[in-house]
Amino acid sequence: GELETSDVVTVVLGQDAKLPCFYRGDSGEQVGQVAWARVDAGEGAQELALLHSKYGLHVSPAYEGRVEQPPPPRNPLDGSVLLRNAVQADEGEYECRVSTFPAGSFQARLRLRVLVPPLPSLNPGPALEEGQGLTLAASCTAEGSPAPSVTWDTEVKGTTSSRSFKHSRSAAVTSEFHLVPSRSMNGQPLTCVVSHPGLLQDQRITHILHVSFLAEASVRGLEDQNLWHIGREGAMLKCLSEGQPPPSYNWTRLDGPLPSGVRVDGDTLGFPPLTTEHSGIYVCHVSNEFSSRDSQVTVDVLDPQEDSGKQVDLVSAS
């Protein structure tokens, strides 16, 4: 006869491990008992369980409640056992020693490999600001056994670097993603992808990039100066900018206080019916936590009568 087992049994942390040991005997041969022991190098054999044809299953106190025989029906030549709820400390070498009649004793060894799936964590780097050089966007760490693979999935252009730390029964892998921040990256996803044989599918953690910036400010509303004449209603100036975080707007007049009746509504400055008093230099001040910008325009409110008079003069002068 001969023993049938596996060289390696692989199980995920917390699952049950079946340790196979089957005696393929000639007809008439019987298995008296099967002794299972842990036999890691440098240490004596530690009893796991004894399956006896008459006495039944004896489980070592160290494994009480964790070792069982596979459910019926059972073949009397099958000395396999189930190790419940495998933990990392169970990883190692195991031996089954089979006592048969009349052929004698046989033994076989197997290695139990306990996969410890990683629980990845993603840590964003320092605040990203436009104008910075190469900057850490995020780091992703995953610890498991064996060492997990950590990669990045993103449309953003950047560079990655990885390092690994080996522990007694596992390895931690950290990958960093560096980039040169630009406003076009704002809102873009940066996904850490962790692969491991103990995972049914890759684990993904997504971080949304936030790049602080503030665009140049400009003022709209003076495109047609002829519209800015005395008596005109609904005249307004709008300050244009964009930023992250979204900026706030403030309006001032360079050559004095804002005239009465002028309404400030965020990025918009609304005028009452225009008078010459509204002529002046207006400043839009745009700011966020990252920066501030100014844009100024000169408003010249025209008097139509003056203009037409001047026009006549010009005509007569010609």
Epitope: L50, G56, L57, H58
Partner: antibody, heavy 123, light 107 residues
């Protein structure tokens, strides 16, 4: 024929010592685990100690730990129990018995017993 | 330690009676259970090992059953020489422990 014959019992004062012997014959003595089991007058059976075939890992009942020592001499086919600091509650018939080692520290039932030797601890 | 609880502690029966003695372990012991017979002034004698296996030379009127925690010794037809004290013993763990015994007396 398997035979186990105990000797060495007798009357001893509290605090005294006694050494019991068990002579074995009719089987491969060195291939079996050997135990001492005692029975106080009118009481039930109480396991005392066991020694493995290879003379390693002697085991003791809590009630005798530190006072009794089990040993064997496979060349003489003899099992011993050295009893020190004896107490009145150690008064009993002491039996030796054999059991087959299955594996590790797991044994069969004791299939053969000696006739016993009486130890009386009294002042 | 594993406690072995035997019942009854004594019983009276007549020759030819069917006698049943039970033994309960405080935790599972698979079939690591033996039954012994002891007569006054004599050493215990192994009757049943592995809960249900008859020791060589023991009459077939003795039988054992059970596994785990609950075990039974049955004497199918009591004979005069069967009047004795019967003990169960577990040897699943160290220390091995005995039941308190069941004395079978003549009615």
């Amino acid at each position: 024929e398997v035979q186990l014959v105990e000797s060495g019992g007798g009357l001893v004062q509290p605090g005294g010592s006694l050494r019991l012997s068990c002579a074995a014959s009719g089987f491969n003595f060195g291939g079996y685990g050997m135990s001492w089991v005692r029975q106080a007058p009118g009481k039930g059976l109480e396991w005392v100690s066991r020694i493995s075939p290879g003379d390693s890992t002697p085991r003791y009942a809590d009630s005798v730990k530190g006072r009794f020592t089990i040993s064997r001499d496979n060349s003489k086919n003899t099992l011993y129990l050295q009893m020190n600091s004896l107490r009145a509650e150690d008064t009993a018939v002491y039996y030796c018995a054999r059991a087959e080692l299955l594996a590790f520290d797991v044994y069969t039932a004791s299939d053969y017993w000696g006739q016993g030797t009486l130890v009386t601890v009294s002042s | 330690d594993i406690q072995m609880t035997q019942s009854p502690s004594s019983l009276s029966a007549s020759v030819g009676d069917r006698v049943t003695i039970t033994c309960r372990a405080s935790q599972g012991i698979s079939s690591y259970l033996a039954w012994y017979q002891q007569k006054p002034g004599k050493a215990p004698k192994l009757l049943i090992y592995a809960a249900s296996s008859l020791q060589s030379g023991v009459p077939s009127r003795f039988s054992g059953s059970g596994s785990g925690t609950d075990f039974t010794l049955t004497i199918s037809s009591l004979q005069p020489e069967d009047f004795a004290t019967y003990y169960c013993q577990q040897h699943y763990t160290t220390p091995p422990t005995f039941g308190q015994g069941t004395k079978v007396e003549i009615k």
